[in-house]
Amino acid sequence: TQNKALPENVKYGIVLDAGSSHTSLYIYKWPAEKENDTGVVHQVEECRVKGPGISKFVQKVNEIGIYLTDCMERAREVIPAAKHHATPVYLGATAGMRLLRMESEELADRVLDVVERSLSNYPFDFQGARIITGQEEGAYGWITINYLLGKFSQKTRWFSIVPYETNNQETFGALDLGGASTQVTFVPQNQTIESPDNALQFRLYGKDYNVYTHSFLCYGKDQALWQKLAKDIQVASNEILRDPCFHPGYKKVVNVSDLYKTPCTKRFEMTLPFQQFEIQGIGNYQQCHQSILELFNTSYCPYSQCAFNGIFLPPLQGDFGAFSAFYFVMKFLNLTSEKVSQEKVTEMMKKFCAQPWEEIKTSYAGVKEKYLSEYCFSGTYILSLLLQGYHFTADSWEHIHFIGKIQGSDAGWTLGYMLNLTNMIPAEQPLSTPLSHSTYV
């Protein structure tokens, strides 16, 4: 008789990452009988919802269902119908919604209520929509990359699955950059974490981890730009803002009301004698860098060492995976290679920012001008944040690995979030470990 393949006993999970600038839906898959093994969960699909982040629907909440339809339909197509009812769906909203909640708890709740109602209409096992904390965002990002890199497995491998993987079991730190916040998470070297708010204790696969994490709200790339503009317009002599973070020849009119819409610019708010101002790019990396540094208050630190704004940061330790916008921006600028030194990155940023806007537009015709215009700022901001904010140096720069995907799964908080909520990371090492490659029965 012919051998028949047994039906695949697999499980699926869906996580929606409701970020400040957009929403992405991730579909994960794993063998049902290996749930507690490390590294078995992998991403089978990412569907990026076409449109802005959910916080932008605050004035038209009734349309959130329309906005989510295409990606939820895609999930219905990808996941076999028989598995729909057993597939958990989680939505986690990050800093965009944290900011909306700061402005109005009622409006944030209304957005989440409609999200929940919309997602409950689908044939999946909807588990709720919530605003995750910055600490969770950092922690789950750290769990994701270390899970995918195989850092939690007790067996050291003789091969590397990714170019920057070291064979030791030292975990990677996680650097996450979004539109509205940025997270830094790592295991410090035998260092006490002086600030309890920044300390996390995990027991994963039989090993204890003392993890440092902090999320800087308003220091994602988009909110940092709003902060910089609000700071710089304070000292402008008229309604022209000559801005070194935009290419020479670039011009854009900004409404003052838009500038002061976000809670992130409140500290710079003042009554201006005009309702609009015009950004005029002058494309100077060094001046842009200096302007960005003014967003980091390093004059006060109640601990042995701080990042900025009085936030404790232990000495950096080990390798770091930098993902989300750290990766997207550096990828666009072609600066993700392991071989590119920090000095070279700075040099290339200087050249890029100095390029005339008309030249840039011609070179990147397929990129929306709003986004294209901001790469000079974003690249400079990343360098400023990593070097002056987090105290990386020219030497330790080589320990930063700009990561988009690991083994086909996106680096980010969503996988760690799902692993945690589905109890797929055991505290103790599973008793029966799978057979290794070299073992045959």
Partner: antibody
Framework: EVQLQQSGAELVKPGASVKLSCIVS????????INWVKQRPEQGLEWIGR????????KYDPKFQGKATMTSDTSSNTAYLHLSSLTSDDSAVYYC???????????????WGQGTTLTVSS | DIVLTQSPASLAVSLGQRATISCRAS??????????MNWFQQKPGQPPKLLIY???NQGSGVPARFSGSGSGTDFSLNILPMEEVDAAMYFC?????????FGGGTKLEIK
Amino acid sequence: EVQLQQSGAELVKPGASVKLSCIVSGFNIKDTYINWVKQRPEQGLEWIGRIDPANGNTKYDPKFQGKATMTSDTSSNTAYLHLSSLTSDDSAVYYCARWGYDDEEADYFDSWGQGTTLTVSS
Amino acid sequence: DIVLTQSPASLAVSLGQRATISCRASESVDNYGISFMNWFQQKPGQPPKLLIYAASNQGSGVPARFSGSGSGTDFSLNILPMEEVDAAMYFCHQSKEVPWTFGGGTKLEIK
């Protein structure tokens, strides 16, 4: 400003194939879906299908399956419609279009190409 | 396939008056609490233009005199007050399920 620029009119012989293009400017083609719509002279609109340029996923009206193939090239911000085994029934104006939310604000808008006239005749 | 039947096939309305166009679907176009019905306007020699999406939401830049209503299988497009620039063909369109389909069209003229 969002624009969809379609290739020029085509006169082709029955049995031949043709590839129509739709160049997108003002936004990244990956941030939207591109629909293709057929309109014969003095007739209604027929939806051919839709492509998601971010990943190449497509949806077709089954009656155009085998006749039409939608593709996209994200590096040139261009969508394509390939029509094969042409007959006189394929003579029509073909539109590429996007409709959906803007990626910055929750504004729902549409943009259409000017249309490409395809004439199939010996 | 979901068949959309528009009525009337043609309509003449005086300036300032109300124009109502109906669209009936062969089965419900509602799903997940949303009515997947859209309305397009087309003028001679031009591509169509989106007026209404999801039964009742106005497209960006669409004048307030255009409104949509309905759910399930019965939908209508209203124009009030009718203006000269509104003389055109109007099509309903469902995007509930593939294949997406259009109605046969209604020709709106000025009386």
